[in-house]
């Protein structure tokens, strides 16, 4: 019950926070105009990874898309490469732990590979966190390095706009809900490698029910072979003696007394 | 078709109140910000503040604070301007604007003229 | 605050002449984030509220006729009237829209000989 809890939370933590990844990602606040040397500014600008904006008083907002790829800073296109790697990692972990969760069953799959399948999420939502954590880390340094050396006519790592001196930038809310998406995306990843080791009992235990089983569970019938093997009717074509782990469903029964003469 | 309607003219004595009023029609009253501006007769223009009817955030240009007060009613799509304390230099025209695009005013009131007269 | 200041303070010219007047701000109105002047140019014929004419320094409003053109950017700006007619006579203001207190300047007064 444990094992199913820890791997359902890690996968919704896991989602808030690659749903939270997307949404940064997606986000024109990266960085915002810093007020504090001009709060009587009646233009604000702000800039996300793929378009920069400016907010008029007036309430109108205007964005500008970087629609050149070469001309882009660098530190900006390796900040976006991250945030998507990110982003697919998790998508992609989402879908196989998914199929990995205890409490959803898909065909005869085994326990064992959904404890591979639950750590192979796991370990995928601990580099998309570690991704987006980086990405965002990243270009709020640069952003720090930008914010003192802004003097007039410097190329800043915002879309290659020429600067004038009163504009500077500062950590914008997409820099934040990255910050707890990616923490929240690794914490989900830890949970689920966590409940991967719980869902993989150890061999041995197993073997030894098997071998108990394979002595003493062989019932004869009146006009037949060998009609059970004490496992039940094996509908599921599973092989029985595979020596790893078993899904509840599974657990061994023995022969009942309509089995006998 | 945008209109800016304002009250009539104002005559009042030192030391009192007045308050104006502006309707406007022909759009979204709530999507557009209201700004106030003074002319003294034969003389320039001087921007009071302004009042956003959607939150009802309102900025003053400090030399008026205290003196004006700004408020919005939406559902009469109407703003408001109250000048307190009133003395002759507070005998002007006063004009309502809605502000567009690069923050300049594209409409106006026809103005409230105010005499202060004892 | 920003100080705007206009010259000439008047002028006095033929119709068909072409006229140009200056604003100056004291800080630059330019703002980086999208490469705009945020100056407005208006016209206050007597006894009427002011009309926009040209808002982001060069864009001019609609209804206006293209006789009026704005240009200049950072501190120095200009409004031209490339054939003054009859109806021009008015005062021209112009106003910083990039910081509060919004200022506008003194004025020009434009007067048909």
């Known amino acids: 019950m444990a094992v199913t809890a820890c791997q359902g939370l890690g996968f919704v933590v896991s989602l808030i926070g690659i749903a939270g990844i997307i949404a940064a990602t997606c986000m024109d606040q990266w960085s915002t105009q810093d007020l504090y040397n001009n709060p009587v500014t009646a233009v604000f600008n702000y800039q996300g990874l793929w378009r920069s904006c400016v907010r008029e008083s007036s309430g109108f907002t205007e964005c500008r898309g970087y629609f050149t790829l070469l001309g882009l800073p660098a530190m900006l296109q390796a900040v976006r490469a991250l945030m998507i790697v990110g982003i697919v990692l998790g998508a992609i972990g989402l879908l196989v732990s998914i199929f990995a969760l205890k409490c959803i069953r898909i065909g005869s799959m085994e326990d064992s590979a959904k404890a591979n399948m639950t750590l192979t999420s796991g370990i995928m939502f601990i580099v998309s966190g570690l991704c987006a954590i980086a990405g965002v880390s990243v270009f709020a340094n640069m952003l720090v390095t930008n914010f003192w050396m802004s003097t007039a006519n410097m190329y800043t790592g915002m879309g290659g706009m020429v600067q004038t001196v009163q504009t500077r930038y500062t950590f914008g809310a997409a820099l934040f809900v990255g910050w707890v998406a990616g923490g929240l995306t690794l914490i989900g990843g830890v949970m689920m490698c966590i409940a991967c080791r719980g869902l993989a009992p150890e061999e041995t235990n197993y073997k030894a029910v098997s071998y108990h089983a394979s002595g003493h569970s062989v019932a004869y019938k009146p006009g037949g072979f060998k009609a059970s093997t004490g496992f039940g009717s094996n509908t599921k074509n599973k092989k029985i003696y595979d020596g790893g782990a078993r899904t509840e469903d599974e657990v061994q029964s023995y022969p009942s007394k309509h089995d006998y003469v | 078709e945008v209109q800016l309607q304002q009250s009539g003219p104002e005559l009042v004595k030192p030391g009192a109140s007045v308050k104006m009023s502006c309707k406007a029609s022909?759009?979204?009253?709530?999507?557009?910000?209201m700004h106030w501006v003074k002319q003294k007769p034969g003389q320039g223009l001087e921007w009071i503040g302004y009042?956003?009817?959607?939150?009802?955030?309102?900025r003053y240009n400090e030399k008026f604070k205290g003196k004006a007060t700004l408020t919005s009613d939406k559902s009469s799509s109407t703003a408001y301007m109250e000048l307190s304390s009133l003395t002759s230099e507070d005998s002007a025209v006063y004009y309502c604007?809605?502000?567009?695009?690069?923050?300049?005013?594209?409409?106006w009131g026809q103005g409230t003229s105010v005499t202060v007269s004892s | 605050d920003i100080v705007m200041t206009q010259s000439p303070s008047s002028l006095t010219v033929t119709a068909g002449e072409k006229v140009t007047m200056s604003c100056k701000s004291s800080?630059?109105?330019?703002?980086?984030?999208?490469?705009?002047?945020?100056l407005t140019w208006y016209q206050q014929k007597p006894g009427q509220p002011p009309k926009l004419l040209i808002y982001?320094?060069?864009t001019r409003e609609s209804g206006v006729p293209d006789r009026f053109t704005g240009s200049g950017s950072g501190t120095d700006f200009t409004l031209t009237i490339s054939s003054v007619q009859a109806e021009d006579l008015a005062v021209y203001y112009c106003?910083?829209?990039?910081?509060?207190?919004?200022?506008f300047g003194s004025g020009t007064k434009l007067e048909i000989k």
């Open positions: 604007t809605r502000i567009y695009y690069g923050n300049a005013m594209d409409y």
């Open positions: 022909g759009y979204a009253f709530t999507s557009y910000v």
């Open positions: 009042i956003n009817p959607y939150s009802d955030g309102t």
């Open positions: 800080q630059s109105l330019l703002n980086s984030g999208n490469q705009k002047n945020y």
């Open positions: 982001w320094a060069s």
């Open positions: 106003q910083n829209d990039y910081s509060y207190p919004f200022t």
